[in-house]
């Protein structure tokens, strides 16, 4: 971890499960103490920190567990707990008689589980690289990509589905490979669609407004997490995009504009873009919208292209002490591919993490094409 | 920096031809589309013809369709409006224009978007008179 | 074919006003709609595109809004070298036919 990369206020020890936050005043860690809102506080902490959810939480006991490290306990303010998507809004530094405080283990992301070390001008990648891609089917052909969220959650672009392509038995997601003709990758069913609300060109087929391109897509049944198949990480909550921060977008579409889709899966490292510059005149000139970004180098040669939308442009960090991957942004949009100061365009996907958490919460029964604002 | 440059007006008879240039640079040519806009003396603008020169699709104004042939040589960045049975309502500045596309990048083929004319040339002037 | 009606067809005004042009479209062209100010003898220049995005390195004293199918320029302090002609224009995405105004020509009062 560099020194420019601070830790995370919330924690997880990976020794025995106890969440553990800042104290920015006093400069310490402190423990969660117990209350009867463990479940909530234990959701809200593993959101905070990037992850999807608390698989379980318990109590620990400082007497017998110790301290490790942190001095003191914070407390939640329960009344204020069900109206706020921030932990760090709702605590404060406490006595905590009891000595018990909270535990969590968080479903794990962003890590590949093997010792492993187009996209246009990318490269092929290796199996178990990038396990959380998959490939949006529709009809057997590959449309769109897509970020396994969990083993049943899958985040895409939302323009991924015209009305055109609403027949949600026809779709099938495609992981655990890195070549599309592999025997070796799962296959599995659709069982809903999610897409924002605020979408427009679903609204108005010609609206030139295409900001809220993200959608989820619910599976049918469970992926197996194993070796090729793993989640991706989520931003932690009020964790920015670093200018000029390189990353990596990853697909199976085209290598060239309006060329062949690749038949493994293409890897390239992109540089995040300002806003600033990517809306100047000579780029975009003020099409970037404030839930967008742009990715890419001014002189063109590496990008995303044509059936890439909806998969991951991934950062790695080390703000979770464990160097993880996290979701940063969705292959959307761009003029051509690869071309200078035309560089590809992502849905910020740290602007939807509550719509995210919101649909996941909501339509885990759902059916068929719905819609969240 | 972007440069769009007109040539080929001039004088010519009613019934008469005239082949119009646009020298683009400064841009990506493939992925613009280019236009071609007049103006008759004191009136507005008028569009006239539109091409998108990737797909090579090309569009046109009722008043010029079956009389001017829109086109665009990619490896001169160049565009260019043949104007053929020409009348004396077509005299005009006309001018060159470009607009930015951008499509999405899913695996079936996208509508290409275009959005307003950002780069326009000097004009060129087409007088038609006996 | 969609007609763009622009009003005024000429309006007089001082330094400082505030203007405001209108147009409106014969049928929905959703937000595809740019504004264009040009002055005698030379070429348009974009202000104004999808309707209210204003177009890099123009003053911000220039905005556009949408409400249904109908679009507004408005200059909010108007300045000397802003006495010029305007002219909206749809580019409707679905035929990529291009309709402009008749345009609105503002003169000094």
């Known amino acids: 971890r560099s020194d420019q990369e601070p830790l995370y206020p919330v924690q997880v020890s990976s020794a025995d499960a106890r969440l553990m936050v800042f104290d920015k005043t006093e400069g310490t860690w402190r423990l969660l103490c117990s209350s009867r809102s463990n479940a909530r506080v234990a959701g809200l902490s593993c959101e905070e920190m990037g992850f999807l959810r608390a698989l379980t939480h318990s109590e620990l006991d400082v007497r017998t567990a110790g301290a490790n490290g942190t001095s003191g306990f914070f407390c939640v303010d329960e009344g204020r707990l069900p109206h706020t998507q921030r932990l760090l809004e709702v605590i404060s530094v406490c006595d905590c008689p009891r000595g018990r405080f909270l535990a969590a283990i968080c479903q794990d992301c962003g890590r590949r589980k093997l010792p492993v070390d187009r996209i246009v001008g990318g490269r092929d990648t290796s199996l178990g690289r990038w396990p959380w891609q998959v490939s949006l089917r529709y009809d057997g052909a590959h449309l769109c990509g897509g970020s396994l969220l969990s083993g049943d959650w899958v985040l895409t672009a939302a323009h991924c589905f015209p009305e055109r392509n609403r027949v949600l038995s026809r779709w099938r997601v495609f992981a655990g490979a890195v070549a599309q003709a592999s025997p070796h990758g799962l296959q599995l069913g659709v069982q809903a669609v999610v897409y924002h609300g605020g979408y427009l060109p679903f609204r108005d087929p010609n609206s030139e407004e295409n900001s809220n391109d993200i959608a989820l897509v619910h599976l049918s049944s469970p992926l197996p997490l194993t070796e090729y198949i793993q989640p991706v990480c989520l931003p932690a909550a009020g964790q920015a995009l670093v200018d000029g921060k390189i990353c990596t977008v990853t697909g199976w579409g085209n290598t060239q504009y309006y060329g062949q889709q690749a038949g493994v899966l293409q890897e390239a490292r992109v540089p995040i873009i300002s806003n600033d510059v990517c809306n100047g005149a000579d780029f975009y000139g003020n099409q970037i919208k404030p839930k967008m970004f742009c990715a890419g180098y001014p002189e063109g040669g590496i990008d995303a292209c044509q059936g890439d939308s909806g998969g991951p442009f991934v950062c790695e960090d080390s703000i979770s002490r464990t160097p993880r991957w996290r979701l940063c942004g969705i292959v959307s949009w761009g003029t051509g591919c690869a071309l200078a100061q035309k560089p590809g365009v992502y849905t910020k996907v740290s602007d939807f993490r509550e719509w995210i958490f919101q649909a996941i919460k909501t339509h885990s029964e759902a059916s068929g094409m719905v819609t969240q604002l | 920096e972007v440069q769009l440059v007109e040539s080929g007006g001039g004088l010519v008879q009613p019934g008469g031809s005239l082949r119009l240039s646009c020298a683009a640079s400064?841009?990506?040519?493939?992925?613009?589309?280019m236009h071609w806009v007049r103006q008759a003396p004191g009136k507005g603008l008028e569009w006239v013809a539109s091409i998108y020169s990737y797909y090579g699709s090309t569009y046109y104004a009722d008043s010029v369709k079956g009389r001017f042939t829109i086109s665009a040589d990619t490896s001169k960045n160049t565009a260019y409006l043949q104007m053929n049975s020409l009348r004396a309502e077509d005299t005009a500045v006309y001018y060159c224009?470009?607009?930015?596309?951008?499509?999405?990048?899913?695996?079936?083929?996208?509508?290409?978007?275009?959005?307003?004319?950002?780069?326009w040339g000097q004009g060129t002037l087409v007088t038609v008179s006996s | 074919d969609i007609q763009m009606t622009q009003s005024p067809s000429s309006l007089s005004a001082s330094v400082g006003d505030r203007v405001t042009i209108t147009c409106r479209a014969s049928q929905s062209v959703s937000s595809a709609v740019a504004w264009y100010q040009q002055k005698p003898g030379k070429a348009p220049k974009l202000l104004i595109y999808s309707a209210s995005s204003l177009y890099s390195g123009v003053p911000s004293r220039f905005s556009g809004s949408r409400s249904g199918t109908d679009f507004t320029l408005t200059i909010s302090s108007l300045q000397p070298e802003d006495f010029a002609t305007y002219y909206c224009?749809?580019?409707?995405?679905?035929?990529?036919?291009?309709?402009f105004g008749q345009g609105t020509k503002v003169e000094i009062k």
């Open positions: 400064g841009f990506n040519f493939s992925y613009s589309y």
């Open positions: 224009q749809q580019y409707y995405s679905s035929y990529y036919l291009l309709t």
């Open positions: 224009a470009r607009s930015d596309s951008w499509s999405y990048k899913s695996g079936y083929t996208q509508k290409i978007y275009s959005k307003g004319l950002d780069y």
